[in-house]
């Protein structure tokens, strides 16, 4: 089966999509919806998807949700959570996206995609 880590070009695509979201944001992203914060560590792609999948009716992040599914080996459904979540903290989607973007940029700079 495919390797567990996204190759560099795929990671770059995800980063570019997150950049687009942050740059094109006019009104509050997803009407200010709140999502669970996550640990940006191993398994973060599934954790990020598990958190964002609970936001519905927000077209701005639909492509991000879909891209993240390509980095997570198992099916993720709304209401599904793993131990990777910091379940005591909720943040706005906009902040979640910014945090995820900063972390992915760091991984990309460090070459951590092989």
């Amino acid at each position: 089966s495919p390797g567990p880590v996204p190759p560099s070009t795929a990671l770059r695509e995800l980063i570019e999509e997150l950049v687009n979201i942050t740059q094109n944001q006019k009104a509050p992203l997803c009407n200010g919806s709140m999502v669970w914060s996550i640990n940006l560590t191993a398994g973060m792609y599934c954790a990020a998807l598990e958190s964002l999948i609970n936001v519905s009716g927000c077209s701005a992040i639909e492509k991000t949700q879909r891209m993240l599914s390509g980095f997570c080996p198992h099916k993720v459904s709304a209401g599904q959570f793993s131990s990777l979540h910091v379940r005591d903290t909720k943040i706005e989607v906009a902040q979640f996206v910014k945090d995820l973007l900063l972390h992915l940029k760091k991984l990309f700079r460090e070459g951590r995609f092989n």
Epitope: S1, A10, E13, Q65, S69
Partner: antibody, heavy 123, light 107 residues
Framework: EVQLLESGGGLVQPGGSLRLSCAAS????????MSWVRQAPGKGLEWVSA????????YYADSVKGRFTISRDNSKNTLYLQMNSLRAEDTAVYYC????????????????WGQGTTVTVSS | SYELTQPPSVSVSPGQTASITCSGD??????ACWFQQKPGQSPVLVIY???KRPSGIPERFSGSNSGDTATLTISGTQAMDEADYYC?????????FGTGTKVTVLG
């Protein structure tokens, strides 16, 4: 605009070979997995083969394993399907499809399909 | 090998609801997609991730997936919805398409 243009189809005798090409444009080709899907006349859709993005993994349907080879040239934004030992049952319209992103591309959903190229295997 | 089974045909009156089922072992554990194909045209993705609609797909198309069955529902069916519909999933390093369902809009 994302576009996929297949070519290389035609009439070939049983046991013969054919190479299909798919020229892609409008997206970062190297990032995405790509698939070939075929449809025999009056029949349903049948997945043939897939090639992951930069990961380089290939996948085949049992019906073509050992006879067909999928490849890609990211510098030319082109996907290929080399078809050998062709049989009458390989007669179909062959579609090039933009697949998903990432190592688990199959979770994404086949977004964009080409118009297809027709392969006829007959003596 | 993994199989996805659909009814060969479904008939529906304009404005009514059409439901197409897709059955496969533990299909609910996998992401299901649905494609629409009209005569002489390439397939179009109408549902991904069980129930998500790509941009440009009308709201009357919806999907669900649990247990062994995925369902595509067309609410307020229109004449333009007459087409073949295929479900799809990934299993053991291969894509699997359903057998296909022809939706006929009566009248």
């Amino acid at each position: 605009e994302v576009q996929l243009l297949e070519s290389g189809g035609g009439l070939v005798q049983p046991g013969g070979s054919l190479r299909l090409s798919c020229a892609a444009s409008g997206f970062t080709f190297s990032s995405y997995a790509m698939s070939w899907v075929r449809q025999a006349p009056g029949k349903g859709l049948e997945w043939v083969s897939a090639f992951s993005g930069s990961g380089g993994s290939t996948y085949y349907a049992d019906s073509v394993k050992g006879r067909f080879t999928i490849s890609r040239d990211n510098s030319k934004n082109t996907l290929y399907l080399q078809m050998n030992s062709l049989r009458a049952e390989d007669t179909a319209v062959y579609y090039c499809v933009q697949d998903g992103l990432g190592p688990y591309f199959y979770n994404y959903g086949m977004d964009v399909w080409g118009q297809g190229t027709t392969v006829t295997v007959s003596s | 090998s993994y199989e996805l089974t659909q009814p060969p045909s479904v008939s529906v009156s304009p404005g009514q609801t059409a439901s197409i089922t897709c059955s496969g072992d533990k299909l609910g554990d996998k992401y299901a997609c649905w494609f629409q194909q009209k005569p002489g045209q390439s397939p179009v993705l109408v549902i991904y991730h069980d129930s998500k609609r790509p941009s440009g797909i009308p709201e009357r198309f919806s999907g669900s997936n649990s247990g062994d069955t995925a369902t595509l529902t067309i609410s307020g069916t229109q004449a333009m919805d007459e087409a073949d519909y295929y479900c799809q999933a990934w299993d053991s390093s291969t894509y699997v398409f359903g057998t296909g369902t022809k939706v006929t809009v009566l009248g």
